[in-house]
């Protein structure tokens, strides 16, 4: 198994994570790892020097750069907040605030808006992962009710007036929830032809 | 038989151009890098540029850089060297030559040499 | 840049002698080196490639040897037609770099 530098006559490398070709010297040569860069480039006699990157930059990947990438904050004017501070090794971790979704991505989110109000008896579809995307509204099933416009409220059961040793006054619907009475109170005039004998 | 044939040499002021030509045959030109070298008056060898089989890679001494430029069209199986900004010290004796396609990376093959002279 | 130093600059010897040129380099070269000889207004013309290796159609009297920074080319039995200039040249780093050259004249 040869060791970098080594010939390459194919311009191919053995271990395309680890190793590229350099053109000039017609040879494989080794990567820097995960945060460090080239300080010194290889050749035929010698293979690449690395070196750590300095505090406040980082190279994520074996890599043949010469100079580590600057970390860069979470922007708040853009809606993002940082989940993981920036190591020599990663960038900084930024997510949308809460309340808000991704409206711009460029290999990572650069822009977050606020996420659009869901109206009464709708609630926002779950996503796989939060602030990817705008809210999707969705009507409350059966037995549950949303009675606000929200991004983030999620319809609830309606009440069981009988858990409660109380009877039932008005039905829930999608935007409201069941009205109970005591059962020694009177129906309200409206409802006193429907009552069962 | 392989032969390489430099052209385009001569007389030219200070600060003045000229491009050189070398005319490749007897061999598959596209497969292989490509190189200048020059030679002053009673002086020795020296690099000057280089260019990769396909054209996409060139690269320099730092005594020729940004002033001089290798090129190749390997439908024509021609080298070329475009030199400006000429200085009295680029005055030699300018050879194309090719590397061996291999390991060793020795250099097989030169032409006869094209004669620049950089002179008010 | 990796400094050649080819020595002696000329020699002087006569037909049937055993000669040698130096070559030192600056760093080692891992036997990334060749020699090349040179007639007035001739190109160069390849010897000895990686070292020790003998280029196809040179006759077997010129052969290489060395490693790391000390090279040597020899001429065991010199012929007439071999006075001319010697260069080494190192093509393990970039800008690759030729030795001053070694004339070699009839005595």
């Known amino acids: 198994q040869a060791v970098p530098p080594y010939a390459s006559e194919n311009q191919t490398c053995r271990d395309q994570e680890k190793e590229y070709y350099e053109p000039q010297h017609r040879i494989c040569c080794s990567r820097c790892p995960p945060g460090t860069y080239v300080s010194a480039k290889c050749s035929r006699i010698r293979d690449t020097v690395c070196a750590t990157c300095a505090e406040n930059s980082y190279n994520e990947h074996w890599n043949y750069l010469t100079i580590c990438q600057l970390c860069r904050p979470c922007d708040p004017v853009m809606g993002l907040e940082e989940i993981a501070p920036c190591t020599s090794k990663r960038k900084t971790q930024c997510r949308c605030q809460p309340g808000m979704f991704c409206a711009a991505w460029a290999l990572e989110c650069t822009h977050c808006e606020l996420l659009s109000d869901c109206p009464p008896g709708t609630e926002a579809e779950l996503k796989d992962e939060v602030g990817k995307g705008n809210n999707h509204c969705v009507p409350c099933k059966a037995g549950h009710f949303q009675n606000t416009s929200s991004p983030s409220a999620r319809c609830q059961p309606h009440t069981r007036c009988e858990n409660q040793g109380l009877v039932e006054a008005a039905p829930g619907t999608a935007q409201s929830d069941t009205t109970c009475k005591n059962p020694l109170e009177p129906l309200p005039p409206e409802m006193s032809g429907t009552m069962l004998m | 038989e392989v032969q390489l044939v430099e052209s385009g040499g001569g007389l030219v002021k200070p600060g003045g151009s000229l491009r050189l030509s070398c005319a490749a045959s007897g061999f598959t030109f596209s497969d292989y890098y490509m190189y200048w070298f020059r030679q002053a008056p009673g002086k020795g060898l020296e690099w000057v540029a280089t260019?990769?089989?396909?054209?996409?890679?060139?690269y320099y001494p730092d005594s020729v850089k940004g002033r001089f430029t290798i090129s190749r069209d390997n439908a024509k199986n021609s080298l070329y060297l475009q030199m400006s900004s000429l200085r009295a010290e680029d005055t030699a004796v300018y050879y194309c030559?090719?590397?061996?396609?291999?390991?060793?990376?020795?250099?097989?093959?030169w032409g006869q040499g094209t004669t620049v002279t950089v002179s008010s | 840049d990796i400094q050649m130093t080819q020595s002696p600059s000329s020699l002087s010897a006569s037909v049937g002698d055993r000669v040698t040129i130096t070559c030192k380099a600056g760093?080692?070269?891992?036997?990334?080196l060749s020699w090349y000889q040179q007639k007035p207004w001739k190109a160069p013309k390849i010897l000895i490639y990686?070292?020790?290796r003998l280029a196809d159609g040179v006759p077997s009297r010129f052969s290489g040897s060395g490693s790391g920074t000390d090279y040597t080319l020899t001429i065991s039995s010199l012929q007439p037609e071999d006075f001319a200039t010697y260069y080494c040249l190192q093509h393990g780093e970039s800008p690759w770099t030729f030795g001053g050259g070694t004339k070699l004249e009839i005595k």
């Open positions: 260019i990769s089989d396909g054209g996409s890679y060139t």
């Open positions: 760093q080692d070269i891992k036997s990334y």
């Open positions: 990686y070292a020790t």
């Open positions: 030559a090719r590397e061996e396609n291999g390991n060793f990376y020795y250099f097989d093959y």
